[in-house]
């Protein structure tokens, strides 16, 4: 399994940031495909859990990622993005993408460094 | 490193409360949610609820609704676990926990002996 | 609530033996978390969301399953294995955990 991310992000507080992650297998995506998010808070705290796939999402039942977080993407389409909302300050950090298909190995796990900022720079604002 | 230090033993009577504290360190406090699970003498563990520490709201275990009740003190890094009404069955190991991609770390625990 | 059945609830195994338990659930969960215990200390995290390893867990634990029917393998046991597991459940509130699973020495 090989795994793509945007690698850096950048959203304003408040909004609802999509992270993306791609992937690539030699295996056909079936009901053997995983998907686990992760987060590295920037204080270098433990690793928190963000969200599971396995045949449905599955949402994390406590902790501050509850109940804002949600799958977007779409298996057939290689894609295990997700939709992460109303962003905070201390959501500032390393989001990880895992992806296991087996038979297929596992690959590396993918990288989002997410910055959340005030407001977007003016050149953002020109891409938008 | 993180770190959970909980209080030390009790021993009480039927119908007494106990308060248990979790004094924690090595890692942002208001973070993470703190848990608290116990076990019975030689049984399994049961969850009992949990705080989020940034705002103090809470979720119990239906089981111990209206009898416990879970607070922060942000100052100290510290929660709190409070069990009201207490029973001989309530006596066991009270555990506080952190929950990132597990309940990861854990206090040494606190016995609680309920005895007349 | 969900309540988790685990089998065996003692299991004798040797050095080396390959050992499974496995976890019911009474109704289907999302996924399933592993602990291993040992007499007078607190839980320590085996699996985290069915199969990936928690922070410093060798290798030869691994982790499977869906629905209702998950499973803990140890492909190899070694002597710092010998210890109680408990299976536990998280997709639905209150968290679950199994009765435990006894692994004595043969």
């Known amino acids: 399994v090989e795994i793509y991310t945007s690698r850096v992000l950048e959203a304003v507080n408040g909004t609802d940031a999509r992270l993306k992650c791609t992937f690539s297998s030699f295996a056909p995506v079936g009901d053997a495909l995983t998907v686990t998010w992760n987060f590295r808070p920037l204080d270098g705290g433990p690793e928190q859990f963000v969200f599971y796939y396995h045949i449905d999402p599955f949402q994390p039942m406590s902790g501050r990622f509850k109940d804002r977080v949600s799958w977007d993407g779409n298996p057939e389409r290689y894609d295990a993005s997700i939709l992460l909302w109303k962003l905070q300050f201390d959501d500032n950090g390393t989001y990880t993408c895992q992806v296991k298909n087996p038979p297929d190995v596992d690959g590396v796990i993918g990288e989002i460094r997410l910055s959340v900022v005030h407001t977007v720079r003016f050149s953002e604002i020109h891409f938008l | 490193q993180v770190q959970l230090v909980q209080s030390g033993a009790e021993v009480k009577k039927p119908g007494a409360s106990v308060k248990v504290s979790c004094k924690a360190s090595?890692?942002?406090?208001?973070?993470?949610?703190m848990h608290w699970v116990r076990q019975a003498p030689g049984q399994g563990l049961e969850w009992m609820g949990e705080?989020?520490?940034?705002?103090?709201?809470?979720d119990y275990n239906e089981k111990f609704q209206g009898r416990v009740t879970m607070t922060v003190d942000k100052s100290t890094s510290t929660a709190y676990m409070e069990l009201s009404s207490l029973r001989s069955e309530d006596t066991a190991v009270y555990y506080c926990?952190?929950?990132?991609?597990?309940?990861?770390?854990w206090g040494q625990g606190t016995l609680v002996t309920v005895s007349s | 609530q969900i309540q988790l059945t685990q089998s065996p609830s003692f299991l004798s195994a040797s050095v080396g033996d390959r050992v499974t338990i496995t976890c019911r659930a009474s109704?289907?969960?999302?996924?399933m978390y592993w602990y291993q215990q040992k007499p007078g200390k607190a839980p320590k995290p085996l699996i985290y969301?069915?199969?990936n390893l928690a922070s410093g867990v060798p290798s030869r634990f691994s982790g499977s399953g869906s629905g209702t029917e998950y499973t803990l393998t140890i492909s190899s046991l070694q002597p710092e294995d010998f210890a109680t597991y408990y299976c536990?459940?998280?997709?639905?509130?209150?968290?679950?955990f199994g009765q435990g699973t006894k692994l004595e020495i043969k």
């Open positions: 926990t952190i929950y990132t991609t597990a309940l990861d770390y």
């Open positions: 536990q459940q998280w997709s639905s509130n209150p968290p679950t």
């Open positions: 969301v069915t199969s």
């Open positions: 090595g890692y942002t406090f208001t973070n993470y949610w």
């Open positions: 109704s289907s969960v999302g996924y």
């Open positions: 705080i989020n520490p940034t705002n103090g709201g809470t």
